[in-house]
């Protein structure tokens, strides 16, 4: 069998809301993946599991099941959304993200994604990690790949 390539393209949109009383930030982050099937037979994308970390703490998880079938030598672009919550021991971030004296409120998040594909009863998992900048002070829609944060110490896996 030939390879199945998974490429994390980047953040497509980040929508922010706040709970003032709980000093909590809610970020709905939609990411984009390109999955390429280099085989001469179809493969099924069985599931995608994703999580987002802030400062080594998992702030959001998502799982998509029975996603799609990718034909021979074909590629599909898949969007998935991870709802994230920055709260409790990280509630100090609420002050930063809602700071009225600045307009740009960048934070760095680690996006982790695992894609499980199956073909002829065989299962394969491909994982990726990427650091991304997100502005936690406003809603943002991105051109694909715009929000990439290149960290030489922890490169893409």
């Amino acid at each position: 069998p030939r390879s199945i390539d998974v490429k994390y393209i980047g953040v497509k949109s980040a929508y922010v809301s706040y709970d003032v009383q709980k000093r909590t930030i809610y970020l709905n982050i939609t990411n984009t993946l390109n999955i390429t099937n280099n085989n001469y037979y179809s493969v099924e994308v069985e599931n995608i599991t994703a999580q987002v970390q802030f400062s080594k703490t998992v702030i959001g998880k998502a799982r998509l099941n029975n996603i799609t079938i990718i034909g021979p030598l074909d590629m599909k672009q898949i969007d998935y959304t991870v709802p994230t919550v920055i709260a409790e021991e990280m509630s100090y971030m609420y002050d930063f993200c809602t700071l009225i004296s600045i307009k740009v409120h960048n934070i760095v998040l680690m996006m982790q994604v695992t894609v499980t594909t199956t073909y002829f009863g065989h299962s394969e998992q491909i994982s990726q990690e990427r650091y991304q900048y997100v502005d936690c002070g406003r809603n943002t829609t991105y051109q694909l790949g715009q929000s990439e944060y290149l960290n030489v110490l922890q490169p893409q896996q």
Epitope: V20, T98, K103, V104, H105, D135, Y142
Partner: antibody
Framework: EVQLQQSGPVLVKPGASVKMSCKAS????????IHWVKQSHGRSLEWIGV????????NYNQKFKGKATLTVDKSSSTAYMELNSLTSEDSAVYYC???????????WGQGTTLTVSS | DIVMTQSPSSLSVSAGEKVTMSCKSS????????????LAWHQQRPGQPPKLLIY???TRESGVPDRFTGSGSGTEFTLTISSVQAEDLAVYYC?????????FGAGTKLELK
Amino acid sequence: EVQLQQSGPVLVKPGASVKMSCKASGYTFTDYYIHWVKQSHGRSLEWIGVISPYNDNTNYNQKFKGKATLTVDKSSSTAYMELNSLTSEDSAVYYCVRTYYSNYFDYWGQGTTLTVSS
Amino acid sequence: DIVMTQSPSSLSVSAGEKVTMSCKSSQSLLNSGNQKNYLAWHQQRPGQPPKLLIYGASTRESGVPDRFTGSGSGTEFTLTISSVQAEDLAVYYCQNDHSYPLTFGAGTKLELK
């Protein structure tokens, strides 16, 4: 329906002060910042400052510090701007504008016309 | 403060024409973190308050017709109206939304020939 209803036109004498209002409805007042913008006759727009109705935090354009004072009354969902030591240079239309925290301006009030003349 | 410079100051066009107006900022409006440009375009029709058209340099506000397109990056931005309608006659302002104090261009006035 979101509305920012501003107070009516005002004519005042030089040296006086004026307090104009911006009454918000159709949304949770404390969830959005209120900005104030000046538009002099036939001229462009100038940002005066912003206030958070939740905690009264403010941020002013240095040019308007000492000239404008922004306040809110949460109980009536109303934002206020007071302008002091008025001169003819302060004659303009003043708009209140809503933003969801640091997001973009999404709703503008209809404007309050201030005329300073002796 | 970031200075916003718009050109031309006025444009005389016929209905159905394509129109392009320019906006330049004295400093970059690019958020170097997320690579997003924090520039907005507002439309002000005669006797009305301004209305948001475009934010993030290229994202149309909901309800804004798709004949309005924003583009550009860093310090140079463009607003294009693909086919001008009578209701588009207005003054168009670009706005720095990257850093305080927020600043506006002097506007481009769109008039009918």
